[in-house]
């Protein structure tokens, strides 16, 4: 299969900026490349086909170029409606592989997350499972790392993260990380902690609780 690699995965920009997204194919696809724009909850919209041909109705600020293995999509002057995720797709072969996407986000000022930790509810514990939630509120940029520690032992593979869309007012994100354990495992341990790192924080922030004391 032909692999498609897009970069960057996130692009921070302001209205009026000129932005360029790159797409590389693992082997030559001539000019059999399309670009799509997708907004949350909506179907992808075709912008460009055959690398540089503008789809009807698409503004001329979208410019496609390239051939062989290297392609670019340039937005000459970013407009408010252009904040979205962009995908390249090759259609030289049957697999019609997509790139992994580039999210064009509103460039905000750096904001460190406010961090909160929530133990499982008594109601949930009755069902035999325990979910501990670490909430990161109102941070920018989106890159943040959450590490779970149980009795100071690093946890891996038993947590899931969910990130909100960028807030339209202040350009921040919020994230929840959920550590899921069986009730039996939860009750074997005492100290539950989430450690958060983000570029707005000079040092990691740790929030914790002692089971049975909250």
């Amino acid at each position: 299969d032909i692999q498609m690699t897009q970069s960057p995965s996130t692009l921070s920009a302001s209205v009026g900026d000129r932005v360029t997204i790159t797409c590389r194919a693992s082997q030559s696809i001539n000019t059999w490349l399309a670009w799509y724009q997708q907004k949350p909850g909506k179907a992808p919209k075709l912008l460009m086909y055959k690398a540089s041909s503008l789809e009807s109705g698409v503004p001329s600020r979208f410019i496609g170029s390239g051939s062989g293995t290297e392609f670019t999509l340039t937005i000459s002057s970013l407009q408010p409606d252009d904040f979205a995720t962009y995908y390249c797709q090759q259609y030289n072969s049957d697999s019609k592989m997509f790139g992994q996407g580039t999210k064009v986000e509103v460039k905000g000022t750096v904001a460190a997350p406010s961090v909160f930790i929530f133990p499982p509810s008594d109601e949930q514990l009755k069902s035999g499972t325990a979910s501990v939630v670490c909430l990161l509120n109102n941070f920018y940029p989106r890159e943040a790392k959450v590490q779970w520690k149980v009795d100071n032992a690093l946890q891996s593979g038993n947590s899931q993260e969910s990130v909100t869309e960028q807030d339209s007012k202040d350009s921040t994100y919020s994230l929840s990380s959920t550590l899921t354990l069986s009730k039996a495992d939860y009750e074997k341990h005492k100290v539950y902690a989430c450690e958060v790192t983000h570029q707005g924080l000079s040092s990691p922030v740790t929030k914790s609780f002692n089971r049975g004391e909250c």
């Epitope: 996130t10 890159e143 790192t197």
Partner: nanobody
Framework: QVQLQESGGGLVQAGGSLRLSCAAS????????MAWFRQAPGKEREFVAS??????????????FYGDSAEGRFTISNDNARNTGYLQMNSLKPEDTAVYYC?????????????WGQGTQVTVSS
């Protein structure tokens, strides 16, 4: 390991300018992001600005970020050939008085500041 050394601090009048430098040595190829923080007496260390030094998968190298206090007045930049980061500070105010620290994250831990300089004092007089 990466070593960071700041320079360029000093005494300046309100409305004036200063350029801080941060010279990196050691495993500089492992730097992902370089940032400036500042700490005024009795206050917490505050983020000022950052620049992506070596692009990972997320942002292009050269992408810049600013804190509220710096936006519009300060400019962060770097010179990879010289392994040096810069913070150009214009329209300085007395409230910008602080010790300014250079910090860096690594490609392995791109959101954690594992490396810090010793700091350089900036004093803005009214």
């Amino acid at each position: 390991q990466v070593q960071l050394q700041e320079s360029g601090g000093g005494l300046v009048q309100a409305g004036g300018s200063l350029r801080l430098s941060c010279a990196a040595s050691g495993r500089t190829s492992s730097i992902h992001l370089m940032a400036w923080f500042r700490q005024a007496p009795g206050k917490e260390r505050e983020f000022v600005a950052s620049i992506i030094w070596t692009g990972g998968t997320t942002y292009y190298a050269g992408t810049t970020f600013y804190g509220d206090s710096a936006e519009g007045r300060f400019t962060i930049s770097n010179d990879n050939a010289r392994n040096t980061g810069y913070l150009q500070m214009n329209s300085l105010k007395p409230e910008d008085t602080a010790v300014y620290y250079c910090a860096a994250t690594s490609l392995e831990n791109p959101t954690r500041y594992d490396y810090w300089g010793q700091g350089t004092q900036v004093t803005v007089s009214s």
